[in-house]
Interface confidence: medium
Amino acid sequence: FAPVPRLTWEHGEVGLVQFHKPGIFNYSALLMSEDKDTLYVGAREAVFAVNALNISEKQHEVYWKVSEDKKSKCAEKGKSKQTECLNYIRVLQPLSSTSLYVCGTNAFQPTCDHLNLTSFKFLGKSEDGKGRCPFDPAHSYTSVMVGGELYSGTSYNFLGSEPIISRNSSHSPLRTEYAIPWLNEPSFVFADVIQKSPDGPEGEDDKVYFFFTEVSVEYEFVFKLMIPRVARVCKGDQGGLRTLQKKWTSFLKARLICSKPDSGLVFNILQDVFVLRAPGLKEPVFYAVFTPQLNNVGLSAVCAYTLATVEAVFSRGKYMQSATVEQSHTKWVRYNGPVPTPRPGACIDSEARAANYTSSLNLPDKTLQFVKDHPLMDDSVTPIDNRPKLIKKDVNYTQIVVDRTQALDGTFYDVMFISTDRGALHKAVILTKEVHVIEETQLFRDSEPVLTLLLSSKKGRKFVYAGSNSGVVQAPLAFCEKHGSCEDCVLARDPYCAWSPAIKACVTLHQEEASSRGWIQDMSGDTSSCLDKSKESFNQHFFKHGGTAELKCFQKSNLARVVWKFQNGELKAASPKYGFVGRKHLLIFNLSDGDSGVYQCLSEERVRNKTVSQLLAKHVLEVK
């Protein structure tokens, strides 16, 4: 299990910027316009545009309220007029440089509209949002805009019992088959498009990936066994001519594995997914947050998957088929029979075109019937190194974003920012042999779940934005200036931070104007380069005989041990003479002449089998 975060920052301790509008709740849709330096925020009955550099500066706002009549009709159907029968913004996607595509639950009558970014007004199109946006604000949803067409995963009816993955397109709308083998009570988490590789074969197609958790179709237990999935469809899919008419011909899904090797610890509830794309990466990497199905202990894990592994399962894996096996928990088994050509579920690529299959509309019925009956792959998608990147106890992770950053020595590190259901943000760096949890920041004053996380990693301007029920918070990727000494700065093992001996401060890397000459950073936590010992200061105290002295010591690191020394001997709390307050401050009881002298508070921190010792405070005590 991962260690506790080395540092804990309380809400008021660090520089966080907040945005919220009184009376507005559920800030759950965030969209960044990097070129405009604007963050768009979708909340309940409102959309805002705020300055991405300082989100407390609101630029525009527009309200989209539900009429009293609609509210009443919704309430008649047994829904809450005060909460459920409102308009929760669920889709906030870019349509063009001057407009956004916005959908809301609209009192259980999902509706979509175009938001003009110049006037910041809705165009009043009121398109039916069925299949694009959930009816119920409590139901899961995901969407991505690809080439002006909305790809969504949500529920298609009032009850939320008909799941759908669809493409809203004027010329070629497509959807999933309403059948349990395709989607079985899914909880949608994430969707994104992966563009064809520029080095890949000619005629490849872009693919849209959907991530969700669903009830297992392949196993049957006493309880509903949940299984995390990745599904994919091809952008060029146009449906079938007869079989699978107006349905996906390229819909395939596979199980995601995230488990601790050689233990029974299986993480099968998917919470969030982030696609890491970076110049140094050969291919995108999917980072995913999971919790176990029976999570009475508060466990969370992060697993990472390469695009190649996901693609391999869909392009070369075996299929599953429905089986009727008596006295067996297995309902689906591996299909070993002949597979039609072209391969079922494959995108129309140059190979297919060479065989005269120029579109999914002229695929043979055999291929279409096969994919209709076998949407589930037998092979599972396994994580990088066959194990989670991180397993954390006593926490329920909700969202994740990942930044790839270059340390002072030129090494690239993946830094994960993972939010919790109690309003905190954990920051963890993936090192060669371990994951180091750098810090935990309490983003929201109240312990409320983080609903959405967004990373803006524009050069020279990097922030994490978090949305919750009460508002949005903007946090920098590092709080380097909070590390007061060279040792603290290096022990943080934060790739964004380095110590500048010239200005005797911990500074943030990659600030355009700064020269990093002579800066000190060591991702193994080696502080031996920290030579500039700051001038020792001491606190002088005078106490009366028989009294009690309290000597203060402030230690931030949760991984360090505080040691008090008097005349070079370590003081133990076990003796009746001494006590500790909060494992840091020292109490000396029944003072006498022999207690006069120099008391030193040191922190001892184990890093890579070495103990780093730092003097935190020096107290000179005189008993009169």
């Epitope: 199980r255 070369r316 591996r334």
Partner: antibody, heavy 122, light 110 residues
């Protein structure tokens, strides 16, 4: 870290029964298939058969009539019996874990024992 | 006789690229994925490539795998002396309902 260790008689006479056991340390036993693979001196690898924690087996058709693989989940062990041995059965015998994700095509031998040499000689 | 066919030997000078082929049939390489193993003298085999072309954990990216139809191949670029070993391909065979190996290729670094 998972470790596999083979044990059993190293020298046999023709027509005897070869008997080997593989002990699995440091890992979960269920969820995997466990294989026996052999390698005659100076030759290539030959798969003998596999078993999972519940006793389900698959055998190499060419050896099927002489092979029995069994499992003891309480001890995290699995065993190989090869009857009526001849000099052609002289080989280094390896046990290995077959990792199955899904049911088969996504599979591989990810952990191996160090191997034990079995010699058949009169 | 091994079900999968590999050349018995291959060689290359340090720094060169060497390719080892593995030929099978429809019931094994054609429909199932191929794994490659390296066996250094006197040791047990070690997994190099799985699922046709995915690199096993801790293996140098100078090793790469590929597959087309019923043939697979292993390529080693920037050859190093310590890579002198036997290399085996393996796949599941649907007809035999079992694992099949190639006969192995002895790689010599000149």
């Amino acid at each position: 870290q998972v470790q596999l260790q083979e044990s059993g008689a190293g020298l046999l006479k023709p027509s005897e029964t070869l008997s080997l056991t593989c002990a699995v340390y440091g890992g979960s036993f269920s969820g995997y298939y466990w294989s026996w693979i052999r390698q005659p001196p100076g030759k290539g690898l030959e798969w003998i058969g596999e078993i999972n924690h519940s006793g389900s087996t698959n055998y190499n058709p060419s050896l099927k009539s002489r092979v029995t693989i069994s499992v003891d989940t309480s001890k995290n062990q699995f065993s190989l019996k090869l009857s009526s041995v001849t000099a052609a059965d002289t080989a280094v015998y390896y046990c290995a874990r077959t990792r199955y994700y899904g049911s088969g095509s996504w599979s591989l031998f990810d952990y191996w024992g160090q191997g034990t040499l079995v010699t058949v000689s009169s | 006789q091994p079900v999968l066919t590999q050349p018995p030997s291959a060689s290359g000078a340090p720094g060169q690229t060497v390719t080892i082929s593995c030929s099978g049939g429809n019931s094994n390489v054609g429909t199932n994925t191929v794994n490659w193993y390296q066996q250094l003298p006197g040791t047990a085999p070690k997994l190099l490539i799985y699922y046709d072309d995915l690199l096993a954990s801790g293996v140098s990216d100078r090793f790469s795998g590929s597959k087309s139809g019923t043939s697979a191949s292993l390529a080693i670029s920037g050859l190093q002396a310590e890579e002198e070993a036997d290399y085996y391909c393996a796949a599941w065979d649907d007809t035999l309902n079992g694992w099949v190996f190639g006969g192995g290729t002895k790689l010599t670094v000149l």
